[in-house]
């Protein structure tokens, strides 16, 4: 599939999910925490100030790096699964953490999460940006 | 392997524009997000801006933002800075650095640098 | 947005001899603390990421410590080519920024 439909896909269930976590949740936009977010890479679900919430690798990386197997579950579609079976040492786990000023940067960044051969990339001519 | 150089710079009065470009080599210019820092004369490193890999993603210093635009042409290999409603304080040597990252990251590789000087 | 100060400002040493810089940060920044390293006329060199992961290329005698607001950048044994500016910089939070730098000069 191309990369452009897999954001749009994954950009939508996540724009579902949020609001389905936001119900469960209680949260509203004058919620103390952080509001779930798409951030044009991966979809990261409303947290409370203080929690860390952790991700798989998004599918973009199943692009970029074919080859690429990680330890850890990918995220269930229904819903945002279950962040305990997650943990940042494995390879491919990316976290943000909920502050009072916002959600921080991902941390390890995508690319040193979730790897990149950079001359790999070079083989090929393809275009993987998106449309945002 | 990687190359990224910097052109634009140049004297210009408080209140014009300038646009900066950086020309990218060496690698996958699409995949990677792109920064621009500044060093003032004999002063230290000023973190300016970064774009991710398709230019969806913007963030900018807050000294800069609503004057400084970053951008990018993916076809191009170009990194871009436009920057308006010059300064004095804006007088630096401009650098633009490879993210190591698709959304933003930390500056691995960098050019050396365009100088911008804003004078009357 | 988050502040980080570097000590010393300047750090008057003789080859050989062993370096400390210390970077701390306003609020924590987990461990998304780099190092670089720049040289009169040049452009910085990334040094350390993620607060002690070397890089290839690095010499081993770089090494860096710390997480959430204390970070120490090491050179065991300083080489006539270290001489230089050292900033530290964190991607932890948006906008990045850059602490004020430490000199390392020689003695």
């Known amino acids: 599939m191309h990369s452009d439909c897999i954001f749009k896909k994954e950009q939508a269930m996540c724009l579902e999910k949020i609001q389905r976590a936001n119900e469960l949740m209680g949260f509203n936009d004058s919620s103390p925490g952080c509001p779930g977010m798409w951030d044009n890479i991966t979809c990261w679900k409303p947290a409370h100030v203080g929690e860390m919430v952790l991700v798989s690798c998004p599918e973009l990386f199943r692009i970029f790096n074919p080859d690429q197997v990680w330890e850890t579950e990918t995220i269930g579609e229904s819903d945002f699964g279950d962040s305990n079976s997650l943990d940042l040492s494995d390879m491919g786990v990316v976290s943000r953490n909920c502050t009072e000023d916002g959600w921080s940067e991902p941390f390890p960044h995508y690319f040193d999460a979730c790897g990149f051969d950079e001359y790999e990339s070079e083989t090929g001519d393809q275009d993987y940006y998106y449309l945002s | 392997q990687v190359q990224l150089v910097e052109s634009g710079g140049g004297v210009v009065q408080p209140g014009r524009s300038l646009r900066l470009s950086c020309a990218a080599s060496?690698?996958?210019?699409?995949?990677?997000?792109m920064h621009w820092v500044r060093q003032a004369p004999g002063k230290g490193l000023e973190w300016v801006a970064v774009?991710?890999?398709?230019?969806?993603?913007?963030y900018y210093a807050e000294s800069v933002k609503g004057r400084f635009t970053i951008s990018r042409d993916n076809s191009k290999n170009t990194l871009y800075l436009q920057m308006n409603s010059l300064r004095a304080e804006d007088t630096a040597l401009f650098y633009c650095?490879?993210?190591?990252?698709?959304?933003?990251?930390?500056?691995?590789?960098w050019g050396q640098g365009t100088l911008v000087t804003v004078s009357s | 947005e988050i502040v980080l100060t570097q000590s010393p400002a300047t750090l008057s040493l003789s080859p050989g001899e062993r370096a400390t810089l210390s970077c701390r940060a306003s609020?924590?920044?987990?461990?998304?603390l780099h190092w670089y390293q720049q040289k009169p006329g040049q452009a910085p060199r990334l040094l350390i990421k993620?607060?002690?992961q070397s890089l290839s290329g690095i010499p081993a005698r770089f090494s860096g410590s710390g997480s959430g607001t204390d970070f120490t950048l090491t050179i065991s044994s300083l080489e006539p080519e270290d001489f230089a500016v050292y900033y530290c910089?964190?991607?932890?939070?948006?906008?990045?920024?850059f602490g004020p730098g430490t000199k390392v000069d020689i003695k």
């Open positions: 650095a490879r993210g190591y990252d698709i959304l933003t990251g930390y500056p691995d590789y």
């Open positions: 060496g690698f996958t210019f699409s995949r990677f997000a």
């Open positions: 774009i991710s890999f398709d230019g969806g993603n913007k």
């Open positions: 609020q924590s920044v987990g461990r998304s």
């Open positions: 993620y607060a002690s």
């Open positions: 910089h964190q991607s932890s939070r948006l906008p990045f920024t």
